[in-house]
Interface confidence: low
């Protein structure tokens, strides 16, 4: 876990400033798998290589993020960089969290996690335990560290929820399961509300 993210970052850091700009423009029009959302143009154009890598992984998760990066690089004629990513993909294998369930397809189904976002931000206190349960399966290393870096429980939960829009149903279920184990009474209370 995290290896694909590092490979994407290395590839993007190999781009010149103008190539990075072209990469972003192509990312705005590239054909996406059904159900996946597009990174908003305004935010996308303001990102450096690190920000963009994090956004690619949070929107598409590692496996599809890697694939998408390769597609765009090939489209730009940067075959060598794309080949380096292909090698990483073959070595690391597919990441389960980026499986066939589209990341954006469940956003409208009213999952517990979406319904109770504000309450969870306000009331979850044992965030590190939740993070450990999600680390490796749902959260990349970079995302895990980013949430851990926040100081208060509320800030940690806000940061965690910043990644939720790109999650599929499996990811949201994993968070719910972690909450049931760590904050069972809170979950029961919210389910009854």
């Amino acid at each position: 876990m995290g290896r694909a993210r590092d490979a994407i970052l290395d590839a993007l850091e190999n781009l010149s400033g103008d190539e990075l700009k072209k990469f972003k423009m192509k990312l705005l029009t590239v054909q996406l798998r059904e159900g996946y959302g597009r990174i908003p143009r305004g935010a996308l154009l303001q990102m450096d290589a690190i920000d963009l890598t994090d956004k690619l992984v949070s929107y598409y998760l590692e496996s599809y993020g890697l694939e998408l990066t390769m597609t765009v690089l090939r489209d730009m004629g940067l075959q060598e960089l794309a080949e380096q990513l292909q090698t990483t993909k073959e070595e690391s294998g597919a990441v389960a969290a980026a499986a066939s369930v589209p990341a954006q397809s469940t956003a409208r189904t009213g999952h517990f996690v979406d319904q109770h976002r504000q309450a969870l931000i306000a009331r979850v206190t044992e965030v590190d335990g939740v993070l450990d349960a999600l680390h490796g399966s749902v959260l990349t290393e970079g995302q895990y560290q980013a949430v851990r870096a926040e100081t208060t429980s509320q800030d940690k939960m806000r940061k965690l929820f910043s990644f939720v829009p790109s999650w599929n149903l499996t990811c949201k279920d994993s968070l719910l399961q972690a909450l049931k184990e760590i904050h069972p009474y809170l979950v029961m209370d919210l389910e009854q509300s």
């Epitope: 970052l9 290395d10 850091e13 190999n14 010149s16 400033g17 103008d18 190539e19 990075l20 700009k21 072209k22 154009l45 303001q46 450096d48 290589a49 690190i50």
Partner: antibody
Framework: QAQLQQSGTELARPGSSVKLSCKAS????????INWVKQRTGQGLEWIGE????????YYDEKFKGKATLTADKSTSTAYMELRSLTSEDSAVYFC??????????WGQGTLVTVSA | QIVLTQSPAIMSAFPGEKVTITCSAT?????MHWFQQKPGTSPKLWIY???NLASGVPARFSGSGSGTSHSLTINRMEAEDAATYYC?????????FGSGTKLEIK
């Protein structure tokens, strides 16, 4: 206030080496490429190379490979350029500049290197 | 590598006159950047990504172009615009600069 502070004037003997520094402040050093540019008196700008401090990745103009070595120290937010086997052709002002495409390029004040016997 | 050729090398213009500096590339360049430099000072970013004025640059300046042909235009020349202007491409390593255009006021 973002700043790049370059080291002072260098007077060097032919055949020797110098190491120029470029200290960053007021911005996150690791997310920018740091470029180095040469300008001889009365001449134009020549791009030497670029380093990404986070990864240590470097890119050089072929002309400066073997002449210049770019490094960076993340702990002190300082980029370095070592010039070796100096000749009079290396006498010039050397600029460091940070880049991030939507902000364009921001330059240090320059370091004058004079190579003389 | 991409070679950038600027023309003219030196030019002078009257106050109020329209000035155009061109930058021709040996290969297609996605975006061109322009720098202004006055004697004894560091270059300043003047126009970035072909047509965007850097902070503090007067609106009389503009940039345009695509592919191998790019230009910087001053709508009405003023004394403070006297300087050397350089184009730079960051589309492909190694990044390269044009040879510069020295603009003087008559």
């Amino acid at each position: 206030q973002a700043q790049l502070q370059q080291s002072g004037t260098e007077l060097a003997r032919p055949g020797s080496s110098v190491k120029l520094s470029c200290k960053a402040s007021g911005f996150t050093f690791t997310i920018y490429g740091i470029n180095w540019v040469k300008q001889r008196t009365g001449q134009g700008l020549e791009w030497i190379g670029e380093i990404y401090p986070r990864s240590g990745n470097t890119y050089y103009d072929e002309k400066f490979k073997g002449k210049a070595t770019l490094t960076a120290d993340k702990s002190t937010s300082t980029a370095y350029m070592e010039l070796r086997s100096l000749t009079s052709e290396d006498s010039a002002v050397y600029f460091c500049a940070r880049s991030r495409e939507w902000e364009g390029v921001f330059w240090g004040q320059g370091t004058l290197v004079t190579v003389s016997a | 590598q991409i070679v950038l050729t600027q023309s003219p090398a030196i030019m002078s213009a009257f106050p109020g006159e329209k000035v155009t500096i061109t930058c021709s590339a040996t290969s297609s360049v996605s975006y061109m950047h322009w720098f202004q430099q006055k004697p004894g000072t560091s270059p300043k970013l003047w126009i970035y990504s072909t047509s965007n004025l850097a902070s503090g640059v007067p609106a009389r300046f503009s940039g345009s172009g695509s592919g191998t042909s790019h230009s910087l235009t001053i709508n009405r020349m003023e004394a403070e615009d006297a300087a050397t202007y350089y184009c730079q491409q960051r589309s492909r390593y190694p990044f390269t600069f044009g040879s510069g255009t020295k603009l003087e006021i008559k």
